[in-house]
Amino acid sequence: LEETLLNTKLETADLKWVTFPQVDGQWEELSGLDEEQHSVRTYEVCDVQRAPGQAHWLRTGWVPRRGAVHVYATLRFTMLECLSLPRAGRSCKETFTVFYYESDADTATALTPAWMENPYIKVDTVAAEHLTRKRPGAEATGKVNVKTLRLGPLSKAGFYLAFQDQGACMALLSLHLFYKKCAQLTVNLTRFPETVPRELVVPVAGSCVVDAVPAPGPSPSLYCREDGQWAEQPVTGCSCAPGFEAAEGNTKCRACAQGTFKPLSGEGSCQPCPANSHSNTIGSAVCQCRVGYFRARTDPRGAPCTTPPSAPRSVVSRLNGSSLHLEWSAPLESGGREDLTYALRCRECRPGGSCAPCGGDLTFDPGPRDLVEPWVVVRGLRPDFTYTFEVTALNGVSSLATGPVPFEPVNVTTDREVPPAVSDIRVTRSSPSSLSLAWAVPRAPSGAVLDYEVKYHEKGAEGPSSVRFLKTSENRAELRGLKRGASYLVQVRARSEAGYGPFGQEHHSQTQLDESEGWREQLA
């Protein structure tokens, strides 16, 4: 990028540069018109018959350097060929010399600084590449010379440029004074300010563009070269903040549009809001969950929003004495999550009707909560109690929801307790055809024993037709019509209002071989 300090092509007033000495044959200002009929100014000199050692100086106005360390001067000039000048003597030249003088203010006068090299600093002696030929009465022909010179290093507030003619016939058509600077550059979301190079290469610190954040690591920098070009160097530096994506060739961060989001800083573009979420503003780093939907604390910010599951379905109970097996189907709606678990709540009601949460005597296998399979076994149920089990399905966002948790209930009433097994049977008397039996009255928890059932069969005769039953209301019984000297297996069970208890252990008894042995008491 070039920053102009002076361009005579753009000057609208007389330049009125200073000449020295005040003699004939000096530089003179002329004007012309460009294609748009705007005035353009030039300087001409043509003292080809000058006295030896006589120089014609032309000095520009004071030019503030505006921080430039090196300034470039592009000269456009034409130079008349000495051979085309009939009056040209040996002092005719086809070169001129360029100088500059630095000062902190516009202090030069018509006589100072002294018109000579030192204090003036010589830049170069300029020779014409193209010479203009002029024949009498004809128009001059020849190409314009363009020469760019480099001034510096400069340190004062400004400078003057001076041209010294020592016998040329030439026209200085235009002067462009400029310095080179690295233009403001935005690359990889990092902005590097416009920089005037003060050395061969200058490191320039970058700053993140609006809505970008620095990447970890060293802060981004780029090198501005003396020629006004940025040194090519990969720049990692900044990335768009959450809620913003890179745009316009990685030169700016654009806010995510409504309905999109970007959760992290860094590369990547805004994504549509995940399921069951929305963003009503631009620049969203996260999409808000719809009413009734949530993200668990452990869910990524970009995860869909989910909802608690519906209740489990079709709870099936199988009661087996004091044990209960419950089984159910998964809820219709999982809420959009994989982390489904089940939990049970339990209430028990006594026969009298008073109800309370289940006591600690119940055990749940594998447990009352955090169940991953849809079943549980409950043990330790008490007889003649009514149990209500509420089966709930839960997931990672159930704890975030307000309102009741849906459940599927199941009611189970346990049987009243039947009498225990009768096991201590003894034979009180035996004969060849009968056996008299007695047993202890079992302790029935739910009311008295109403009667007993005796089940017996001859040992070795196992078929259903060989089994015989006898009911008795006392805790004794006589089995008649038995075979002589045969072995019998006897079992007894008691009945209360709750029903029959289990048969006790088989008792082994034997009938007499003959009458002579008489009645004999036998103990089991």
Epitope: D14, K16, Q22, E28, E29, L33, T42, L80, C169, A171
Partner: antibody, heavy 126, light 108 residues
């Protein structure tokens, strides 16, 4: 010798036309930027019109714009001023004048008039 | 556009210095030229580029220009210097020339 000689002046009625000529000699006319300057009786100098060396650029004072036309014939070393719709206030001595010339580049000229003709009187009256 | 203002007349005794002023806004930033016109004659350039003298013009004629005023100075004025003097400068485009109203120099 180097000189400019105007001709074509005279008496003309208001609304009438007149064409002034300026014959150049003694210098390379086709390298010179030329102008017309007038001077009303007892008054000061007033610039009227200008033309560049090749004749492609022209310029006029507001007082004559649209009525006067400057032109040149470099092959005849002559400058012209065609004056139409003349008014009484156009009565003046009309001078042709040469701008200071470049040494060799007719695209440019100095801003002063370094050569003047003797003038020609134009009288606009009924 | 610039307007150039001159005093209508200036009088000077022979041999004395005559100064004729020409004023205009920021005139010092423009080149000013001076013309001498004697009765019945065409104007003659006496000073150009503020202070330069064309060949054939006596050394007693000099010029300066700064600020808002340009000055034509005739030192050791002679009777033959009696004439009208006009300053001129160009306006915003180089082809438009403006003249001052003229100053009549009388040599007493």
């Amino acid at each position: 010798q180097v000189q400019l000689v105007e001709s074509g002046g005279g008496l003309v009625q208001p609304g009438g036309s007149l064409r002034l000529s300026c014959a150049a000699s003694g210098f390379t006319f086709n390298n010179a930027w030329m102008s017309w300057v007038r001077q009303a009786p007892g008054k000061g100098l007033e610039w009227v019109s200008a033309i560049n060396a090749k004749g492609q650029f022209t310029s006029y004072a507001d007082s004559v714009k649209g009525r006067f036309t400057i032109s040149r014939d470099n092959s005849k070393n002559t400058l012209y001023l065609q004056m139409n719709s003349l008014r009484a206030e156009d009565t003046a001595v009309y001078y042709c004048a040469r701008k200071g010339m470049s040494f060799y580049n007719n695209k440019y000229a100095k801003s002063m008039f370094d050569l003047w003709g003797q003038g020609t009187l134009v009288t606009v009256s009924s | 556009d610039i307007e150039l203002t001159q005093p209508p007349s200036v009088s000077v005794a022979p041999g004395q210095t005559a100064r004729i002023s020409c004023s205009g806004d920021n005139l010092g930033k423009k080149y000013v030229h001076w013309y001498q016109q004697k009765p019945g004659q065409a104007p003659v350039l006496v000073i150009y580029y503020d202070s330069k003298r064309p060949s054939g013009i006596p050394e007693r004629f000099s010029g300066s220009n700064s600020g808002n005023t340009a000055t034509l100075t005739i030192s050791g004025t002679q009777a033959e210097d009696e004439a009208d003097y006009y300053c001129s400068a160009w306006t915003t485009t180089m082809m438009h020339i403006v003249f001052g109203g003229g100053t009549k120099l009388t040599v007493l």
